[in-house]
């Protein structure tokens, strides 16, 4: 089974390196969650060929997956500390759902995509402890959430298959900016 | 499960028009995505146009943008296809698709629901 960051040997220190900071630890962690994207990625584009054609395949998107934008205060350009983190924390929340939609959508990397989902929740409580403003996070309502899940289950295979390719992608997205905004602060 | 009627089709000069119509039955209508999308004999089902649910968004193939005009009666359960400057490739038979999902294909494969298709032939 795949292992969390901090579960590998590799990762214990040795007698006279210093141990991993939190920064490091955030940096290291979403890094094997993007590890962990691209292999289901793979899979998704061997089996199907949306990720060329997913562009002109679609009229619109509905899917409302999270998306870094100016106010968010993440980009270099008006960087925000305390904006961002609520950005990036609120933002992985709202992935959530969309992970667990992700559970039954892979044969040959079913374990990668239950790393992805748990290194996910891992992550969010890291930040929850570097955040000072936890008040400004919105979670998702549970509810909200069921019958946005039970819709997206509901789908044909070739919409489920556009779903993973298009969720898979704002993910991976969302992550190169935290990762880029979190190396700032 | 949703049942689509089309009508409306039949023989019309280069430069004329045509109504297609799509009545729907079954589940709430205003919940679906409804498309048209046709096919010429040896050709592939090619996507013409879609409207969102409420009715706020369409989207056109590039060869009817200007031409065509989609829109829908969610009170009568009825989605329409106006076509104006009509050609000898409109030539085809129409079909109506219908989907309930977050995402509006413009494939063939994105859409659940389908109905029998109306001809269109347009032919001096």
């Known amino acids: 089974a795949p292992v969390l960051p901090g579960e590998d040997s590799k990762d214990v220190a040795a007698p006279h390196s210093q141990p991993l900071t939190s920064s490091e630890r955030i940096d290291k962690h979403i890094r094997y969650i993007l590890d962990g994207i691209s292999a289901l990625r793979k899979e998704t584009c061997n089996r199907s060929n949306m990720c060329e054609s997913s562009k002109e395949a679609l009229a619109e998107n509905n899917l409302n997956l999270p998306k870094m934008a100016e106010k968010d205060g993440c980009f270099q350009s008006g960087f925000n500390e305390d904006t961002c983190l609520v950005k990036i924390i609120t933002g992985l929340l709202e992935f959530e759902v969309y992970l667990e939609y992700l559970q039954n959508r892979f044969e040959s990397s079913e374990e990668q995509a239950r790393a992805v989902q748990m290194s996910t929740k891992v992550l969010i409580q890291f930040l929850q402890k570097k955040a000072k403003n936890l008040d400004a996070i919105t979670t998702p309502e549970p509810t909200t959430n069921a019958s946005l899940l039970t819709k997206l289950q509901a789908q044909n295979q070739w919409l489920q298959d556009m779903t993973t390719h298009l969720i898979l992608r704002s993910f991976k997205e969302f992550l190169q900016s935290s990762l880029r905004a979190l190396r700032q602060m | 499960d949703v049942q689509l009627v089309e009508s409306g089709g039949g023989v019309v000069q280069p430069g004329g028009s045509l109504r297609l119509s799509c009545a729907a039955s079954g589940r709430t209508f205003s919940n679906y995505a409804m498309a048209w999308f046709r096919q010429a004999p040896g050709k592939e089902r090619e996507f013409v146009a879609v409207i969102s649910y409420a009715g706020g968004r369409t989207y056109y193939a590039d060869s009817v943008k200007g031409r065509f005009t989609i829109s829908r009666d969610n009170a009568k359960n009825t989605v329409y296809l106006q076509m104006n400057s009509l050609r000898p490739e409109d030539t085809a038979l129409y079909y109506c698709?219908?989907?309930?999902?977050?995402?509006?294909?413009?494939?063939?494969?994105?859409?659940?629901?389908w109905g029998q298709g109306t001809l269109v032939t347009v032919s001096s």
């Open positions: 698709a219908a989907v309930d999902s977050p995402l509006i294909a413009t494939h063939p494969r994105g859409y659940d629901y």
